[in-house]
Interface confidence: low
């Protein structure tokens, strides 16, 4: 009833709780002396369904037959309307429309751990929309019975709070769940099980790993389990992998040796348990153990390359470069690199440990036969040394690769192609493609990149450390025994017209011609590989087209003579630079007049 229904009553027949599709009769009646003050026949009783008026009647009572009510709760309110006054609430009722419970399905019981309690779950079926009680019953040997009730609208889980023990693991238990509401009841099919069927062990705990003699090949995993566990499954993977390695073990008694772990790798380990070979279920996976395996001595060999630079008549500079070993080859933290330099005829040798760098530069005599060996060392030992005989890599002209070209290949890639050398191509043992940013000063500090290519290849895609709008000096070496030939080319992955022209810094007169000197365009303004410079000149104050001279770009060149100027005429000169994408804007303008009249 609503607010104690002091003025009247609302009755509902056959019941406040009805089956979907049923009809109800609602009666609203006034209590004595609760009608309109003056004239009871003026009583107007109005029935509302929620806030919508559905019926009215003059008098002391109102009857209404209602059909088609939806699932759930519908509120009916009866009000009294008297002349010259607001409607007064008399009483109300809620009608609950629902269905009888369906048969609960898939009843399943589990006991988590040997010390846990039995809990069961089931599927309720469709919502009854009514208050529904579920009763779970468990019967066991010796007529033992347990019962638990649940009054939760969404009840599909109950814990008996009892613990099954392994004293008689083959004893049968039967569970059944019954759903009851105002419209009916329904019971599940019984579920029969034994202790071994429903006990799900707790996940293993206290997992640890030991490496005998700090060796990855002698590794044992330890853990603790509940007492009755018979089977375990182990899974493990490198922390950066998504794929698990899986191992099943029987009667492990809390330990297992692992034989296939990689050195210096962080692994994740998990373990699960089961009580019986074919009964029951696996435990949840244990919490993860994360552990790093010990180092082993490096495998593989360093990829080493070198550069020679002439210093003077007696000395040369050797720069060695090498690439880091892969993680799987390093098998630990590389502590240092050992470089040995040896003069092969005199036997003189020098060894140096390099830390924090993958390059080394030294000066050696130009005479003698020199060799280097480079190896990488971690806490367990060193890799096999890579040995290289120092030779003049470009000495053998007949070994020089032919028709070398460099073309942009997508974003930040350059495709280098070549033809085998004229000399017997089968003599080539390997090609090395080397590239570095082009710096007009020939800066030896610029990082060197290289890749090795098999002797039957005539192309290589270079992508490492390639930036857009930067020009690279690319060399292709053909190596054969102690001989080498090379060819070079300039290339870029992306280019546009240079941002500025060269700056003329001096004009000097020599025997009736002039020599123009300029400063190189800053690398960041070249916007790719320069192909040409242009020198423009015209008579001052003249409107005629300027004359020009085009000079092929050479890295080291920064001056050029012009001998077509007339004496005693003042000229204006300027320069531009060109890439394959176009010409730069003008550089600075300079005036000059032959015979000492330059400004």
């Amino acid at each position: 009833k609503i607010d104690a229904c002091k003025r009247g009553d609302v009755t509902v027949k056959p019941s406040h709780v009805i089956l979907l599709g049923s009809t109800v009769n609602i009666t609203c009646s006034l209590k004595p002396r609760q009608g309109c003050f003056h004239y009871s026949r003026r009583n107007k009783l109005i029935l509302y369904k929620f806030d919508r008026r559905i019926n009215f009647h003059h008098g002391h009572s109102l009857n209404s037959q209602v059909t088609g009510l939806p699932l759930g709760t519908t509120l009916f309110v009866c009000k009294l309307a008297c002349i010259n006054s607001d409607e007064i609430q008399i009483c109300g009722a809620e009608i609950f429309v629902g269905v009888a419970p369906e048969q609960p399905q898939n009843l399943s019981c589990i006991q988590k751990g040997e010390q846990g309690t039995v809990a069961c779950t089931w599927e309720r079926g469709r919502d009854t929309h009514l208050y529904t009680e579920y009763t779970l019953q468990l019967s066991g040997p010796k007529n033992l019975t347990w019962q638990k009730q649940c009054k939760d609208i969404y009840c599909d889980y109950l814990d008996f709070g009892i613990n099954l023990t392994p004293e008689s693991p083959e004893s049968n238990f039967t569970a059944k769940v019954t759903a009851v509401n105002s419209l009916g009841s329904s019971s599940s099919l019984p579920s029969t099980f034994t202790f071994l069927d429903i006990v799900r062990p707790l996940p293993p705990w206290d997992i640890r790993i030991k490496f005998q003699k700090a060796s990855v090949s002698r590794c044992t995993l330890y853990w603790r389990d509940e007492g009755l566990v018979l089977l375990n499954r182990l899974r493990y993977r490198p922390s950066n992998s998504r794929l698990w390695n899986m191992v099943n073990v029987t009667k492990a008694k809390g330990r297992h040796d692992l034989l296939d772990l990689k050195p210096f790798t962080e692994y994740e380990f998990q373990i699960s348990s089961k009580l019986h070979l074919y009964k029951g279920s696996w435990s949840d996976w244990s919490e993860s153990l994360r552990a790093q395996t010990p180092e082993e001595e490096p495998t593989g060999m360093l990829d080493v390359w070198y550069m020679k630079r002439h210093i003077d008549y007696s000395r040369q500079q050797i720069s060695l470069f090498w690439k880091n070993l892969s993680v799987s080859e390093a098998r630990g933290k590389i502590l240092h690199y050992q470089v040995t330099l040896q003069e092969l005829t005199g036997g003189k040798a020098m060894t140096q440990n390099i830390t924090g760098h993958t390059s080394w530069t030294t000066v050696i005599p130009r005479t003698g036969n020199w060799a280097v060996a480079v190896s990488a060392a971690n806490s367990k030992g060193s890799s096999l040394p890579t040995r290289i005989n120092i030779m003049n890599l470009c000495e053998a002209g007949l070994l020089a690769p032919r028709q070398v070209s460099a073309n942009s290949e997508g974003m930040d890639n350059i495709l280098v192609t070549w033809q085998p050398p004229r000399k017997d191509p089968s003599a080539v043992q390997e090609y090395v493609v080397e590239w570095r940013e082009l710096h007009p000063g020939g800066d030896t500090q610029v990082p060197l990149n290289w890749l090795r290519s098999r002797p039957y290849n005539v192309s290589a895609l270079i992508s490492e450390n390639i930036k857009s709008y930067i020009c690279y000096e690319i060399r292709v070496y053909a190596l054969s025994g102690d001989q080498g030939g090379c060819s070079s080319i300039l290339g870029n992955s992306k280019h546009k017209a240079p941002l500025s022209g060269p700056h003329i810094n001096a004009i000097t007169e020599e025997k009736g011609s002039i020599l123009i000197s300029w400063n190189s365009i800053p690398v960041q303004e070249q916007m790719g590989c320069l192909l040409h410079y242009r020198i423009y000149w015209k008579e001052r104050d003249s409107n005629s087209q300027p004359q020009l001279c085009e000079i092929p770009y050479r890295v080291s060149q920064n001056s050029h003579p012009i001998n077509s100027l007339q004496p005693r005429v003042t000229y204006v000169l300027w320069m531009t630079a060109l890439t394959a994408a176009g010409e730069s804007s003008h550089g600075n303008e300079r005036e000059f007049c032959l015979q000492g009249k330059a400004n």
Epitope: K1, I2, H16, L75, F96, Y131, D152, I153, Y154
Partner: nanobody, 123 residues
Framework: QVQLVESGGGLVQAGNSLRLSCAAS????????VGWFRQAPGKEREFVGR????????YYADSVKGRFTISRDNAKNTVYLQMNSLKPEDTAVYYC????????????????WGQGTQVTVSS
């Protein structure tokens, strides 16, 4: 067994809003219908509104209809009373109440009650 604790009351100016919360303990709170009531000084306890267990059905007293809204978050075991356009006559202690037998007719006969929270609306 369910314990109810109201919060969110306080002093507010007429025309402003306030949100009361009714927090419940107990795993099966989502099975309960929850009602809000209020009691002004010297007056009887008055029904404000109520919400069904699922939140699908609400019902309000005429005096608050259109201004007050009841909602619930069963995951948080909490029912809310959002009060907008407050008037001085809304000043009262507000109680929430819960009942498991949600098929009974709506009345003041709720089984579980909170201690109440004071709401004062000044003009």
């Amino acid at each position: 067994q369910v314990q109810l604790v109201e919060s969110g009351g306080g002093l507010v100016q007429a025309g402003n809003s306030l949100r009361l919360s009714c927090a419940a303990s107990g795993r099966t709170f989502s099975s309960y219908v929850v009602g809000w009531f209020r009691q002004a000084p010297g007056k009887e306890r008055e029904f404000v509104g109520r919400i069904s267990w699922s939140g699908a059905r609400t019902y309000y007293a005429d005096s608050v209809k259109g201004r007050f809204t009841i909602s619930r978050d069963n995951a948080k075991n909490t029912v809310y009373l959002q009060m907008n356009s407050l008037k001085p006559e809304d000043t009262a202690v507000y109680y929430c109440a819960a009942d498991l037998k949600w098929e009974v007719l709506l009345s003041e006969h709720f089984e579980y009650w909170g201690q109440g929270t004071q709401v004062t609306v000044s003009s």
